[in-house]
């Protein structure tokens, strides 16, 4: 079958993301990638939704991430920006209205970015051969 | 091509208030932010503030907190600037600017900018 | 507030001269640094940007130099349509501050 359209939409989201360094890329959150065993493709769209979003919510104002200078602040809107965009498209191929996220693990935002990248790019092969 | 047209010149009495346009086109309104420049005839610019026309967020220069209010309409690709209880100090044309940005804000720079809007202030 | 000063205020130049015009910031702006010109009644017209880029379009004989507090704008072979107001701007944090400008007269 042929691939969503949303799921050609994230990966170049996450392309743009993960070229991005700012202040706050280094900020950790919960590494739901770390024991993903028994979860579906569906859950872990809808969980690392969740998990963005409350990134999203608790850093998109903060001074530290913002910076003091006009790039800095700048380039901290662009990645705010396109979390938000890589929110709502994983909660649209996820189809799921809320979901848990238990893990005690933390990784960075960087390194989740890169393997929610590894994931997606993994499920394009797959759909595109 | 890229253009920003502002609305015409306006006569307004102090202490009134005072709301000038700013029409994007030929390019994504969304995806750049629009800046608003104050200058005094035959003086200097004045950077008042800016707006992201993607969600409306705002950040003015202190000297203008209170007084100016900038907004957009997605819906026209248009961004207003509006002054209240204006004094003959400001009395000028009022540019709107856009801001160029390449390689995530490796550089960025007033690339377009609109006629300017003169506003007279007088009774 | 970082502020801006520009100098000279004005300078009387000739057709064919080389002229440098000087910006200088009040604190560290890196690089972060446009240049432009203004001619009566017109808008400001972008003709560097990032200190030393010249923007598309903008003939050669112009250019930028600088870093940190210190800026310089050179017309080299000045032309009668180089006559104008000079204004620079730095873009390093909000709020973007202005220099007072310099403006060319003709001797």
């Known amino acids: 079958h042929k691939c969503d359209i949303t799921l050609q939409e994230i990966i170049k989201t996450l392309n743009s993301l993960t070229e991005q360094k700012t202040l706050c890329t280094e900020l950790t959150v919960t590494d739901i990638f770390a024991a993903s065993k028994n979860t579906t493709e569906k859950e872990t769209f809808c969980r690392a939704a969740t998990v963005l979003r409350q990134f999203y919510s608790h850093h998109e104002k903060d001074t530290r991430c913002l910076g003091a200078t006009a790039q800095q602040f700048h380039r901290h809107k662009q990645l705010i920006r396109f979390l938000k965009r890589l929110d709502r498209n994983l909660w649209g191929l996820a189809g799921l209205n809320s979901c848990p996220v238990k893990e005690a693990n933390q990784s960075t935002l960087e390194n989740f970015l890169e393997r929610l990248k590894t994931i997606m790019r993994e499920k394009y092969s797959k759909c595109s051969s | 091509q890229v253009q920003l047209q502002q609305s015409g010149p306006e006569l307004v009495k102090p202490g009134a208030s005072v709301k000038i346009s700013c029409k994007a086109s030929g390019y994504s309104f969304t995806s750049y932010w629009i800046h608003w420049i104050k200058q005094r005839p035959g003086c200097g610019l004045e950077w008042i503030g800016m707006i992201d026309p993607s969600d409306g967020e705002t950040r003015l220069n202190q000297r203008f907190q209170g007084r100016a209010t900038l907004t957009v309409d997605e819906s026209t690709s248009t961004a207003y600037m509006q002054l209240r209880s204006p004094t003959s100090e400001d009395s000028a044309v009022y540019y709107c600017?856009?801001?160029?940005?390449?390689?995530?804000?490796?550089?960025?720079?007033?690339?377009?900018w609109g006629a300017g809007t003169l506003v007279t202030v007088s009774s | 507030d970082i502020q801006m000063t520009q100098s000279p205020a004005s300078l009387s130049v000739s057709v064919g001269d080389t002229i440098t015009l000087t910006c200088h910031a009040s604190q560290n702006i890196d690089v972060w640094l446009s240049w432009f010109q203004q001619k009566p009644g017109n808008i400001p017209k972008l003709l560097i940007y990032?200190?030393?880029n010249l923007h598309t379009g903008v003939p050669s004989r112009f250019s930028g130099s600088g870093s940190g507090t210190g800026f310089t704008l050179t017309i080299s072979s000045l032309q009668p349509e180089d006559i104008a107001t000079y204004y620079c701007?730095?873009?390093?944090?909000?709020?973007?501050?202005f220099g007072g400008g310099t403006k060319l007269e003709i001797k």
């Open positions: 990032k200190a030393s």
């Open positions: 701007q730095q873009a390093h944090s909000y709020p973007f501050t």
């Open positions: 600017t856009r801001l160029k940005e390449y390689g995530n804000y490796d550089s960025f720079y007033f690339d377009v």
